[in-house]
Amino acid sequence: EQAPGTAPCSRGSSWSADLDKCMDCASCPARPHSDFCLGCAAAPPAPFRLLWP
């Protein structure tokens, strides 16, 4: 949930009300209880190119 008056988080990150800060979604697999991970599930990280056909 985005705090009022803050800029949207960049791609691959999500707002943490708990920390008053955008946080990197990459940490969520290891730390699933972080509040910002809820926003990461709704906004997956940037797509990547497959290295094989």
Epitope: A17, D18, L19, K21, D24, H33, D35, C37, L38
Partner: antibody, heavy 123, light 111 residues
């Protein structure tokens, strides 16, 4: 194991600048998600959060004191600093630093505190 | 600022009985899936010690006689059965938004 220790001047006069140091061990302030807060407690009274600094040098302040506060860090020396300008007798308190970082599950509790340093402002 | 009001300010509980401490927030400190309320114990001359994080999650090493509950604006810390070493002042604290604030404290005396 994690430990934090505050140090300060003990006594200073009104209008002076209070400089506090938090020296810590057992964790790194370069770890993503890690942060350190300063909290104070006048004798016999409650707790007041003052400021917080994150691993990436982002900072947050209590709006009621923001104009007087400056928090900073020296990651390589495992130290966090707080300066309070123009102190008055109302700033007399025990000052604590506390770690706020990710636990195993990804919660961010203020889980380790220093023993505190007593500061008296008196003319 | 979110104001946290604790009640009672002090209470005396007999050994082995239940102590119940309330913390009421001036606005909600919860979302649909998260409650940003924490509880600390402080003994004279010592720093606060984290007991419960995020309403009901016991900190490592804290005895199971401590428990927390609540959501929105109303939160409870229960201690049962109370032991002599539980004599202390207890504080609630939220991290829902800045500034992070603490309740005024509840002093627990063991009879």
């Amino acid at each position: 194991q994690v430990s934090l220790k505050e140090s300060g001047p003990g006594i200073l006069q009104p209008s002076q600048t209070l400089s506090l140091t938090c020296s810590f061990s057992g964790f790194s302030l370069s770890t993503s998600g890690m942060g350190v807060s300063w909290i104070r407690q006048p004798s016999g009274k409650g707790l007041e959060w003052l400021a917080h600094i994150y691993w990436d040098d982002d900072k947050r302040y209590n709006p009621s004191l923001k104009s007087r506060l400056t928090i900073s860090k020296d990651t390589s020396r495992n130290q966090v600093f707080l300066k309070i300008t123009s102190v008055d007798t109302a700033d007399t308190a025990t000052y604590y630093c506390a770690r706020r970082g990710p636990d195993y599950y990804g919660y961010y509790p203020m889980d380790y505190w220093g023993q505190g340093t007593s500061v008296t402002v008196s003319s | 600022d979110i104001v946290l009001t604790q009640s009672p300010a002090s209470l005396a509980v007999s050994l082995g009985q239940r102590a119940t401490i309330s913390c009421r927030a001036s606005k909600s400190v919860s979302t649909s899936s998260y409650s940003y309320m924490h509880w600390y114990q402080q003994k004279p001359g010592q720093p606060p010690k984290l007991l419960i994080k995020y309403t009901s999650n016991l900190e490592s090493g804290v005895p199971a006689r401590f428990s927390g509950s609540g959501s929105g604006t109303d939160f409870i810390l229960n201690i049962h059965p109370v032991e002599e070493e539980d004599a202390a002042t207890y504080y609630c604290q939220h991290s829902r938004e800045l500034p992070w604030t603490f309740g005024g404290g509840t002093k627990l005396e063991i009879k």
